[in-house]
């Protein structure tokens, strides 16, 4: 194929791949008709003048995962057709000025996972056709004004995983075509008003894992096309009332891992397209009426691991499309009988790890499609007669780790559980806590006659019997509807997958496999 170096493999499709620790310089001669060249996992430490001079048809060049620490300014001379250049995962600390000069066709430039200490306006001033610039995983401490001024066609810019402590409000002002801006995992403490005003086409803004304490009220007011906004794992203690007001296209908002104590009235809206709202790991103590009422399309609401002790009966007004509601690991002792009445499409609810002593008999009255209810680790001693009767789709019910009182009042519940045992799962069954002579015995098989009789015995000692139908889908514990082995954060659709972490923490947020990626 017009000469293929021995250290490389060359395919008919003009693709050349050179890999291996024995390679210490760019192999020669490279086939003149090469259109794609990959130099991966080598011991190349520097690129000298014009090593690619004879392969001017090259469209894609990947020099990744090498020991590369120095590049001569003319290294990419004569590559006028190059559209894709990746220098990711090397050891570059400095980029020579003029390095990308002459790369008039360049659309994607990947400089991620190096040790770059700074960038200058002159670095990218020739890259007027650039659409994607990846700078994440470097050591950048600031971005000078003008750094991106010539990149008017840029649609994706990743500055995540650097050491940025502040951003100038002018640095992005000319990026009117930008669709994705990632600033996650930096050290930003605040973002000046106007920083994102020029980004009228922005669809994704990733600001998670910084140290942001305050958001300017009008910070996102010009970003009408924003669809995904990631603000998780910051230090945000309050949200200005109008901060999310101009975001009609938003469909995912993550605010978990902040210091929010309350949700100001009208804060979420109008957001007619929001599908997911992640608020776990905050300090929220109560939910007033109508706090989510503008979120008519919301399907996933995660409020776990807060300090919620009171939910107003109209807190979930408007959430007619909600499928998943996570309230576990809070301080709930009481629930008003009307609190879930509006959630007609709810499928999964997690209420585990609270202090619930009893449930209203009609708590699930309007929620006929419930498939999974997590009630483990509360203070429940009994449940009202018929509380689950109308829930024909219920296939997962967790009741263990409650102090069940196994007197004769428990008979109706015991009889229903006996008929619906598969719904309880096989891992842990509910056991009696009192009276003392039956403590630790399974609630399902307990002989209630042995227990101390209650003051009054129900006349009809059984729940109306909803049998377990074998054709109802049953979920083994490892892939259950509310599997507790999940991601600590929602999947953020990153091509570079820099922030996704899997955990085995059994107390994260009680959601479906589908939602946990």
């Amino acid at each position: 194929y017009h000469g293929c170096p021995s250290e490389c493999t060359c395919s008919r499709a003009s693709q050349v791949e050179c890999t291996g620790a024995r390679i210490v310089a760019v192999p020669t001669p490279l086939p003149w008709n090469a259109m794609s060249l990959q130099i991966l996992n080598t011991h190349i430490t520097e690129l000298n003048e014009s090593p690619f001079l004879n392969i001017s048809a090259l469209i894609a060049l990947r020099i990744e995962k090498n020991e590369l620490s120095r590049i001569t300014p003319g290294a990419f001379r004569n590559l006028g057709s190059l559209r894709y250049l990746s220098l990711a995962n090397n050891k570059l600390q400095v980029l020579p000025i003029g390095l990308f000069q002459g790369l008039d066709s360049l659309e994607s430039l990947l400089l991620s996972s190096n040790q770059l200490l700074q960038i200058q306006p002159a670095h990218f001033s020739q890259c007027s056709n650039l659409k994607e610039l990846q700078l994440h995983g470097n050591h950048l401490e600031y971005i000078p004004d003008g750094a991106f001024d010539h990149l008017v066609g840029l649609t994706k810019l990743n500055l995540g995983k650097n050491s940025l402590t502040h951003i100038s409000p002018r640095v992005f002002q000319h990026l009117g075509n930008l669709q994705v801006l990632r600033l996650y995992e930096n050290r930003l403490t605040d973002i000046p008003m106007g920083t994102f005003d020029g980004l009228v086409n922005l669809q994704e803004l990733a600001l998670q894992q910084n140290q942001i304490g305050l958001l300017s009220p009008g910070l996102f007011h010009n970003n009408h096309n924003l669809q995904r906004l990631y603000l998780s794992n910051n230090h945000i203690s309050q949200l200005p009332p109008s901060v999310f007001m101009q975001l009609p296209q938003l469909n995912r908002l993550t605010l978990f891992g902040n210091s929010l104590k309350e949700l100001s009235p009208g804060i979420f809206g109008p957001m007619p397209n929001l599908r997911e709202l992640w608020l776990y790991d905050n300090h929220i103590s109560s939910l007033p009426d109508n706090v989510f009422s503008n979120l008519r399309q919301l399907q996933v609401l995660i409020l776990s691991r807060n300090q919620i002790s009171f939910i107003s009966p109209g807190a979930f007004n408007g959430l007619t499309e909600l499928r998943e509601l996570s309230l576990h690991t809070n301080a709930l002792q009481d629930l008003d009988g009307n609190v879930f009445r509006m959630l007609a499409n709810l499928q999964n609810i997690s209420l585990q790890n609270n202090r619930l002593r009893q449930l209203p008999g009609n708590i699930f009255a309007n929620v006929n499609g419930l498939m999974a209810i997590q009630l483990q680790n509360n203070q429940l001693e009994n449940l009202p007669l018929g509380i689950f009767d109308h829930l024909g789709k219920l296939c997962e019910l967790r009741l263990y780790d409650n102090p069940w009182r196994c007197d004769s009042d428990i008979l109706p519940l015991r009889n229903w559980l006996l008929l619906n045992q598969p719904r309880l799962g096989t891992d842990t069954v509910p056991v009696c806590f009192s009276p003392a002579n039956v403590r630790g015995q399974s609630l399902i098989i307990i002989n209630v006659n042995v227990a101390v009789p209650s003051v009054h015995v129900p006349e009809v000692p059984s729940y109306p019997e909803t049998p377990w139908y074998p054709d109802t889908p049953s979920y083994p514990d490892t892939t259950s509807v509310s599997s507790t082995t999940e991601l600590t954060s929602p999947v953020e659709d990153y091509t570079d997958l820099t922030t996704i972490q899997v955990t085995d923490d059994r107390s994260v947020w009680g959601m479906t496999q589908a939602q946990s990626g």
Partner: antibody
Framework: QVQLQQSGPELVRPGASVKISCKAS????????INWVKQRPGQGLEWIGW????????KYNEKFKGKATLTVDTSSSTAYMQFSSLTSEDSAVYFC???????????WGQGTLVTVSS | DIVMTQSQKFMSTSVGDRVSVTCKAS??????VAWYQQKPGQSPKALIY???YRSSGVPDRFTGSGSGTDFTLTISNVQSEDLAEYFC?????????FGGGTKLEIK
């Protein structure tokens, strides 16, 4: 239908206590919060606090902490409010009220007039 | 505490007229405002909740509007039975608070 029936008027001496009742019917008493509201002549309405009958948990307006005590008797579906160390400022009509589908007062008792006078 | 101010203590109107009762909150309460009607010697009756939603059985001549801090109860085509005192209430944060009331008089 939901009904809240309050006890009759009370005439009490300054420094004494009074306990007024609110009997609920037409719904499951333990499943819904009961609120208490004070109305002094010509002085509008003041929220005193709520109690959740199923657990006995309470929340008070700071202004009434130590003055009002909310309790329930679930066996008779009755909520009680005790007012202590009465002064003329406590002369008012007291209402019990229940929320509906939000934290506004959909159902009201007829009110109990408390007059503090020597 | 959030202060709910009903600036007009009394309003005078005639049968068939349109009248607007206003209420101002000292801080943002979203739409968590209710309006009550209280006739002499009776308990209050909820007319409007969530700022603009009519309670069941309330005639459609009663309408509510507003959000944030400014709220209005409008009675169009006033009837003689509308002679009463009208209170606004915020239920966004504890302690829940009421306005001082506006008495509607029919000329």
């Amino acid at each position: 239908q939901v009904q809240l029936q309050q006890s009759g008027p009370e005439l009490v001496r300054p420094g004494a206590s009074v306990k007024i009742s609110c009997k609920a019917s037409g719904y499951t008493f333990t499943d819904y919060y009961i609120n208490w509201v004070k109305q002094r002549p010509g002085q509008g309405l003041e929220w005193i606090g709520w109690i959740y009958p199923g657990s006995g948990n309470t929340k008070y307006n700071e202004k009434f902490k130590g003055k009002a005590t909310l309790t329930v008797d679930t066996s008779s579906s009755t909520a009680y409010m005790q007012f202590s160390s009465l002064t003329s400022e406590d002369s008012a009509v007291y209402f019990c009220a229940r929320w509906g589908y939000g934290a506004y007062f959909t159902y009201w008792g007829q009110g109990t007039l408390v007059t503090v006078s020597s | 505490d959030i202060v709910m101010t009903q600036s007009q203590k009394f309003m005078s109107t005639s049968v068939g007229d349109r009248v607007s009762v206003t209420c101002k909150a000292s801080q943002n309460v979203g739409i968590n405002v209710a309006w009550y009607q209280q006739k002499p010697g009776q308990s209050p009756k909820a007319l409007i909740y969530s700022a603009s939603y009519r309670s069941s059985g309330v005639p459609d001549r009663f309408t509510g509007s507003g959000s944030g801090t400014d709220f209005t109860l409008t009675i169009s085509n006033v009837q003689s039975e509308d002679l009463a005192e009208y209170f606004c209430q915020q239920y966004n944060s504890f302690p829940y608070t009421f306005g001082g009331g506006t008495k509607l008089e029919i000329k």
